[in-house]
Interface confidence: low
């Protein structure tokens, strides 16, 4: 049976396509190509007579067509208007006709897309942002990438307008991007330049460091304030409610007991209009506030090596203190298997190994005094491997 095949089926605009013919009968008088799904003299592209080897252009000939003796038709510099069906009519020597229809689709070479946004400086937890991938083109697939990854399933991410528009509901500071859109059709793909969002947020509640409360007279008091904010926060300091200075750092040399009091850091974001404050009590004293002896507890004191994990907890009722851990007079953590958490109150060892056996204790301290817990002993056992058939393991 006479058939025709398009090579390729999907063609890029400006390229060429070859309509191949299979199972061409013997004893031919000639053949003719037509635009469309049927034989229509008004839409003839070209006719070919075998005897004279003469090709005759038809009404639908554009000058870009070449017919070959094997009946294949080459169309060069294709346009989107060339998309569609093509019919070959073969006139056999007995003047009985056979027909076959093929088709191909012409797609444009896609341009580099760009991203437009309705709001490039959104406010956190307040604004929504709609990104649109330009241009809008037919027969095009739109894809979006955030941080070079495809879109996660999220109630705050919505696609609309045939995936051409990506909307972020209630943006957060983590939504800065970059965002890219990609357009695809069967013959080409192109990705936009990345776009980032400048999400305005904060300030969050400021943190005053260091965390120490107690200071000796004559020491230098150096406090630093930080609040996550975009744009960066403006800071000011108040002591006992009285404004001091508009800086992020507060430095008072050679302090006396008169410098005891409430130290307030005020953070302001002029764009969001939000303010946050944190108050810290500073006590300057000759007296040593004695830190109470901490309690140490273990989730278990006898464990199996290379299998079990253990948590050691250091408990204290004192505030404004720091905690450190010791094992065989060494400061911890000493390996990647040891992790401190919850303000250093918990020491986790996972997994426990033979070398972790021994005495542990914790120490609580403030700038003026410190105290140690009683030691706790951790025993590490190794289970003997089961033996089979009287053979030694390994």
């Amino acid at each position: 049976q006479l058939t025709t095949e398009s090579m390729p089926f999907n063609v890029a605009e400006g390229k060429e396509v070859l309509l191949l013919v299979h199972n061409l009968p013997q004893q031919l008088f000639g053949y003719s190509w037509y635009k469309g799904e049927r034989v229509d003299g008004n839409r003839q592209i070209v006719g070919y007579a075998i005897g004279t080897q003469q090709a005759t252009p038809g009404p639908a000939n554009s000058g870009r067509e070449t017919i070959y003796p094997n009946a294949s038709l080459l169309i060069q510099n294709v346009t989107q208007n060339d998309t569609g069906f093509y019919t070959l009519q073969v006139i056999k020597s007995d003047l009985v006709n056979e027909e076959a229809t093929g088709q191909f689709h012409v797609y444009p070479e896609l341009p580099k897309p760009s991203i437009s946004s309705n709001n490039s400086n959104p406010v956190e937890d307040k604004d929504a942002v709609a990104f649109t991938c330009e241009p809008e083109t037919q027969d095009t697939t739109y894809l979006w990438w955030i941080n070079n990854q495809s879109l996660p399933v999220s109630p705050r991410l919505q696609l609309s307008n045939g995936n051409r528009t990506l909307t972020l509901l209630s943006v957060t500071r983590n939504d800065t991007g970059p965002y890219e859109c990609e357009i695809q059709n069967p013959v080409s793909a192109n990705r936009s330049d990345p776009v980032t969002l400048n999400v305005t947020y904060g300030p969050d509640t400021p943190t005053i460091s260091p965390s120490d409360t107690y200071y000796r007279p004559g020491a230098n008091l150096s406090l630093s304030c930080y609040a996550a904010s975009n744009p960066p926060a403006q800071y000011s300091w108040l002591i006992n409610g009285t404004f001091q200075q508009s800086t992020q750092e507060l430095f008072i040399p050679n302090i006396t007991v008169n410098n005891s009091g409430s130290y307030t850091c005020h953070a302001n974001n002029s764009v969001t209009g939000c303010n946050r404050t944190t108050v810290k009590t500073i006590i300057v004293t000759e007296l040593s506030p004695v830190v109470a002896k901490p309690q140490i507890k273990a989730s278990k004191t006898t464990v199996t090596g290379d299998k079990d994990s253990v948590n050691l907890t250091c408990s204290t009722n004192d505030t404004g203190i720091s905690i450190r851990w010791f094992f065989k007079n060494q400061s911890l953590p000493s390996s990647e298997r040891m992790k401190l958490s919850q303000g250093n109150t918990t020491l986790s060892i996972n997994p426990v190994k033979r070398e972790d056996a021994g005495t542990y204790w914790c120490e609580v301290f403030n700038p003026i005094s410190k105290n140690q817990s009683d030691p706790i002993m951790l025993n590490v056992n190794y289970n003997a491997l089961p033996q089979e058939n009287g053979l030694s393991p390994g």
């Epitope: 709609a130 399933v153 109630p155």
Partner: antibody, heavy 124, light 107 residues
């Protein structure tokens, strides 16, 4: 006018299967995420699953994960819920729910339009 | 998953009185919270979304407030058609979750 019409409910034995359908009309179906929500006598409303407009993204409540599968045929404007390994506690009225068309210019996934519900009874 | 709780479980109110329903989330859901009304034999009806925005066609006597973890639905003057079960639902994080509901009945 937005319309949602569920079908496929009925009586099924524990361990059995059932497939619910929801025919949608009155809005551009492919543009919107769709939800299944159920009403049980003891627990009230319980969100079951969601599927993104294209069908590529799905999410399930823990109680049905691994047993229920949500899908959609955008050419038919139809949403489906395939329910396998059904349990007595799955007995409920099942609603499909679509979001409101626009909120502040953006599409969200709360249920503004609801079907009339399909009763699923799991009993031996 | 985010757990939603509602209080009270039942609220008995006389027609014309004010009703205040509470909803609490186990973690912050920003303002991504909706309120629904459901009557026996009917599908739920969206009243409020975005914690405080009334859905199309909802009377002004219904109002919502709150953000983060604490939310309130207020019916300023109860009408006879308002006696129903009211549910809150968070849509900030998958899986979406409903509260157990508050039944408002006639005193």
């Amino acid at each position: 006018e937005v319309q949602l019409l569920e079908s496929g409910g009925g009586l099924v034995q524990p361990g059995g299967s059932l497939r619910l359908s929801c025919a949608a009309s009155g809005f551009t179906f492919i543009n919107y995420a769709m939800n299944w929500v159920r009403l049980t006598p003891g627990k009230g409303l319980e969100w079951v699953s969601v599927i993104s407009g294209s069908g590529s993204g799905t999410y399930y409540a823990d109680s049905v994960k691994g047993r229920f599968t949500v899908s959609r045929d955008n050419s038919k404007n139809t949403l489906y819920l395939q329910m396998n390994s059904l349990r007595v506690e799955d007995t409920a009225i099942y609603y499909c729910a679509s979001p409101p068309p626009m909120v502040r210019g953006v599409i969200i996934t709360i249920g503004n339009y609801w079907g009339q519900g399909a009763l699923v009874t799991v009993s031996s | 998953e985010i757990v939603m709780t509602q209080s009270p479980a039942t609220l008995s109110v006389s027609p014309g009185e004010r009703a205040t329903l509470s909803c609490r989330a186990s973690q912050s859901v920003s303002v991504n919270l909706a309120w629904y009304q459901q009557k026996p034999g009917q599908a739920p009806r969206l009243l409020i979304y975005g914690a405080s925005t009334r859905a199309t066609g909802i009377p002004a006597r219904f109002s919502g407030s709150g953000s983060g973890t604490e939310f309130t639905l207020t019916i300023s003057s109860l009408q006879s058609e308002d006696f129903a079960v009211y549910y809150c639902q968070q849509y900030n994080n998958w899986p979406f979750t409903f509260g157990p509901g508050t039944k408002v009945d006639i005193k």
